[in-house]
Interface confidence: medium
């Protein structure tokens, strides 16, 4: 199971002092910045138990293995479900803590209930403040059952769940019908996926017999040990105030683990620390009791004394859980509870034993999970013990599981089971990723998904030119950092592969798939300069430039023109894709804008030095369109146009421009200037008879303005073909019939 503990500080006089801490004992836990260790997540889960919104809770990371949640401002903030998520990949695990309000109407006799598939679970809610209304039981927030208030038994409302199955797991609550949901009793039901003492996909495998209240995990058969116990079967007590799978963590504060609730991965759930009990874990165990929640009884024999943290402390000459075994009986010593080896390695395993008579080499054997017995190849005999060494044949995945070291003498026998984890060296599933490239170097991210097991201890990057038969170059890198491959050849393809290793002998995995990474072209070195520019309209600019003359071919694919509008903080880039080009027309610019302009040569994706900048001011845009344009045929060759001046003029109009075009005609339109800006009427002459024309016009101040609406009109009668339109204008007189 993942070494993940959620600690709740239950000293509840002041909610502001309340905190939750999630502690991970996993290698690489919580680093979060790399692919091997996703971050520890600690949060309130509002999906089932919703509380009134308050100020956001504060999350503080203390190193890579610990995260703490604080900032609770009122008691109602505490009520509900909290979860911590840790571990990587398939080992990602969620630990859940359920907090009840000490002032609730109903209180759970026991918050966490872990039961086996097919068992009957009984949830008991104790009446703390009576109400004479129905009691509603909910499962995961949905209605489940109703009890009448008269149905309380000895001041408790019971919910009996016969033949429970894994889908029955979840958060249960008991609430008086008209009370606030925050006054509910909240429970957590964990249903193991197998019957008692079994684990595995078909529940065919036998659990190791977890001691001291440990719970057998239904997926992997490991014991999830209560806080304060360690070992494959939780056989070993930690020193007082310590917890974690290897007793590596220390309870905070001077009073040790008092007042702390410990939540561990399912199927364990939550309990007080070893030596403590009560709803707030502040009561020491009664004499004769020990362990988490004081659930264990010592029953020490042969003069052993009961320690509330560790159980029986045996006098000299005795050992065993109840001091029931004489020291004359042989005893396996200091056997690691868990060993890890890499696939296809041939490790040596040592097993030490003592006793009277003294164990010899032949009296110690090693049994594999498949029942195969290994005999030791050599033994080291010391005054107080014999250590047998076993040479293990090449390991296969099926060797994962519980191994057993057994010692037999005429004084009796002892055995110790230990877990062997056969790990698969990691193999990259993908090629490394190119981050950036230059002409002589490549920056590569070696972080890739992989098959097999972590943690990753080293990453090797192998590379060589594509289609080359030369030896691979190798660089060893930190798993969390990007790598720069240097001193490469420009414009060259390189084959790049990743090899991952995990700790231990034989931890190197196979090489991952190759990928082709190509170095960039040489950087262009020539600096162009701007020859000149001229404005071709309020939004158009023609630019020309030159390059210095150098011998040899031009290193470049084209030019990049950049226009910087400092007022708006906008940059416009124009790509000229011919290296021979020395001029470009820039259109769609903003009239009346001050631009900074420069040009640079590019080659592939690389830019050369920019030219010295030039400053260009485009003329402002022209005035608004003339209004109410109207056309009226006067004869077979004349049409009169009338209009009104544009509104909101930025300055005096210098002229009007009329556009004349034959309707449906394919030719270019004709533009005619009206040079007397005070005019509001003009006659267009020299038109063809019986011909439909389109007219529109615009005004000019410093630049040409917007076009007016287009009007249509036909010339009259069948006259002679005219030479072409000309105009005559005059001011339209108000009220005069024209």
């Amino acid at each position: 199971a993942v070494d993940l503990t959620l600690l709740a500080n239950l000293r509840l006089t002041d909610p502001q002092r309340f905190f939750l801490t999630c502690v991970s004992g996993e290698a690489g836990a919580g680093r979060g910045s790399d692919a091997w260790g996703p971050p520890l997540l600690l949060e309130k889960d509002d999906r089932i138990v919703r509380t009134p919104p308050g100020p956001p809770l504060r999350l503080a990371r203390n190193g890579s293995h610990q995260v703490t949640l604080r900032g609770f401002s009122k008691p109602s903030d505490l009520v509900g479900v909290f979860s911590c998520v840790g571990g990587a990949g398939a080992r990602r695990t969620r630990v859940i803590y359920v907090h009840n309000s000490p002032g609730a109407h109903l209180l759970p006799d026991k918050v966490t209930h872990t039961v086996n598939k097919g068992d009957t679970a009984v949830l008991s809610a104790r009446v703390h403040k009576e109400k004479q209304t129905d009691v509603i039981w909910k499962s995961n927030g949905s209605y489940f059952y109703t009890l009448d208030w008269h149905e309380a038994q000895d001041g408790r409302f019971l919910l009996q769940l016969p033949n429970v199955q894994p889908p029955s797991s979840g958060i249960y609550s008991a609430t008086y019908l008209e009370a606030s949901p925050l006054g509910s009793a909240f429970f957590r039901l964990i249903v193991r996926g197998c019957g008692a003492g079994r684990w595995g996909p078909g529940c065919t495998k036998e659990c190791p017999g977890c001691l001291h209240g440990g719970v057998c995990h239904d997926h992997d058969g490991e014991c999830v040990c209560p806080p304060g116990f360690t070992g494959t079967r939780c056989e070993q007590a930690c020193r007082e105030g310590r917890f974690g799978q290897s007793c590596q963590e220390q309870c905070p504060g001077i009073s040790g683990c008092r007042g702390l609730t410990f939540c561990l991965p399912d199927p364990y759930g939550c309990s007080c620390g070893s030596g403590w009990r009560g709803s707030q874990c502040q009561e020491a165990c009664a004499p004769g009791h020990f362990g988490a929640d004081c659930r264990l009884q010592c029953q020490c024999q042969n003069g052993g004394t009961c320690d509330r943290f560790s159980g029986c402390v045996c006098p000299s000459g005795w050992h065993g859980v109840h001091c029931e075994k004489s020291d004359r009986i042989p005893q396996i010593l200091n056997m690691a509870s868990e060993l890890e080896f890499n696939l296809e390695t041939m490790p040596r395993i040592n097993c030490a034993a003592a006793g009277n008579p003294f164990p010899v080499r032949g009296s110690i054997e090693l049994r594999k999970p498949d029942g195969t017995v290994l005999l030791s190849t050599k033994a080291i005999v010391e005054p107080e013990k014999t250590t047998a060494e076993f040479e293990v044949p090449r390991l296969v995945l099926a060797d994962s599981g519980f191994w057993e070291c057994r010692v037999s003498t005429s004084g009796g026998q002892d055995s110790r089971r230990f877990k062997v984890n056969v790990k698969v060296p990691p193999v990259p599933l993908a090629a490394p990723r190119l981050l950036t490239k230059q002409s002589r170097q490549l920056v590569v991210s070696p972080l890739v998904s992989f098959s097999g097991d972590g943690p990753i201890s080293t990453v090797r990057l192998h590379y060589r030119p594509q289609d080359s038969t030369m030896d691979w170059s190798t660089i060893v890198v930190d798993p969390s950092e990007n790598v720069t491959l240097m001193n490469l050849r420009p414009k060259t393809g390189y084959s790049v592969r990743v090899q991952l290793s995990r700790p231990g002998e034989g931890g190197e995995g196979a090489w991952g798939p190759p990928t082709l990474m190509t170095t960039d072209c040489p950087e262009p070195l020539l600096q162009p300069w701007l020859e000149g520019w001229h404005v071709e309209g309020t939004d158009r600019l023609r630019v020309s430039w030159s390059l210095p003359l150098v011998p040899g071919p031009l290193v470049g694919d084209g030019f990049l023109l950049r226009l910087w509008d400092g007022t708006r903080g906008q940059e416009r880039r124009e790509n000229v894709s011919s290296p021979q080009a020395r001029t470009a027309l820039l259109t769609g610019l903003t009239p009346g804008t001050h631009y900074q302009l420069d040009v640079q040569l590019y080659h592939c994706t690389l830019l050369g030095p920019a030219s010295p900048p030039a400053h260009v001011l485009l003329p402002p845009s022209g005035p608004p369109a003339p209004r109410h344009l109207h056309a009226q045929a006067l004869s077979d060759s004349e049409i009169q146009l009338t209009w009104k001046h544009p509104e909101a003029l930025p300055g005096p109009i210098s002229k009007y421009v009329v556009e004349v075009q034959v309707a449906g005609g394919a030719g270019d339109p004709l533009w005619i200037d009206v040079d007397r800006p005070e005019e509001t009427s003009t006659i267009i002459r020299g038109l063809n008879a019986s011909t439909r024309y389109l007219f529109r016009m615009r005004a000019s101040i410093q630049g040409l303005g917007d076009w007016s609406n287009t009007v249509e009109e036909s010339t009259l009668g069948n006259g002679l073909q005219a030479e072409g339109p000309v105009q005559e204008s005059r001011a339209a007189e108000e009220g005069l019939d024209q």
Partner: antibody
């Protein structure tokens, strides 16, 4: 399909007895409070009795207390109403109904979400 | 015991009109336990609104409930011919007793 089906109604003389049944289907009967509600001809609705899921608690309207008995058989998904000492004023259509609790984050709501089609009980000499 | 009084006794409106039905409790009650039912001629009642304002499953959105304390309202925004029915309000008490209003008959002109 979630449904309730009443049976057992009929004509009975004053002072006589009758047993109504209500068969439930389409939901977990053993989890819900079940009720009998009646409606005299041309009149409004009147609650008669309620029984809790376990069968351990029952309540009656004052007008039927001591004469009617509500019960349930969770294994058969059936609700019963044993009516003794019947009177003319007990003449009505008798409905069985399920009350379902919905809960939000702040409170729970109770309402009759499923009704049977009703069975007519006529008490007349 | 709390009494529930509905008004008017009968309401006669045309299709498309808005119907407003009132229910008054003799003392302040929790809106969580107030429900409205529709009973069409010859049929069993049907739940429309629970918790004073939440629409039951499958009920058209032209039906809405509101109110708190002692005064509660059922509104039908656009009457349809099939809305012809008797409408009852109902209160779940904190004891198992429940109280129905006497009903409002809705007639469609």
């Amino acid at each position: 399909e979630v449904q309730l089906l009443e049976s057992g109604g009929g004509l009975v003389q004053p002072g006589g007895s009758l047993r109504l049944s209500c068969a439930a289907s389409g939901f977990t009967f053993s989890k819900y409070k079940m009720w009998w509600v009646r409606q005299a001809p041309g009149k409004g609705l009147e609650w008669v009795s309620v029984i809790y899921p376990s069968g351990g608690a029952t309540y009656y309207a004052d007008s039927v207390k001591g004469r009617f008995t509500i019960s349930r058989d969770n294994s058969k998904n059936t609700l019963y109403l044993q009516m003794n000492s019947l009177r003319a004023e007990d003449t009505a259509v008798y409905y069985c109904a399920r009350s379902s609790l919905g809960c939000s984050s702040t409170s729970c709501y109770d309402a009759f979400d499923i009704w049977g089609q009703g069975t007519m009980v006529t008490v007349s000499s | 015991d709390i009494q529930m009084t509905q008004s008017p006794g009968t309401l006669s409106l045309s299709p498309g009109e808005r119907a407003t039905l009132s229910c008054r409790a003799s003392q302040s009650v929790s809106s969580s336990y107030l429900a409205w039912y529709q009973q069409k001629p010859g049929q069993a009642p049907r739940l429309l609104i629970y918790g004073a304002s939440s629409r039951a499953t499958g009920i058209p959105d032209r039906f809405s409930g509101s109110g708190s304390g002692t005064d509660f309202t059922l509104t039908i925004s656009r009457l349809e011919p099939e809305d012809l029915a008797v409408y009852y309000c109902q209160l779940f008490g904190s004891s198992p007793r429940i109280t129905f209003g006497q009903g409002t008959r809705l007639e469609i002109k």
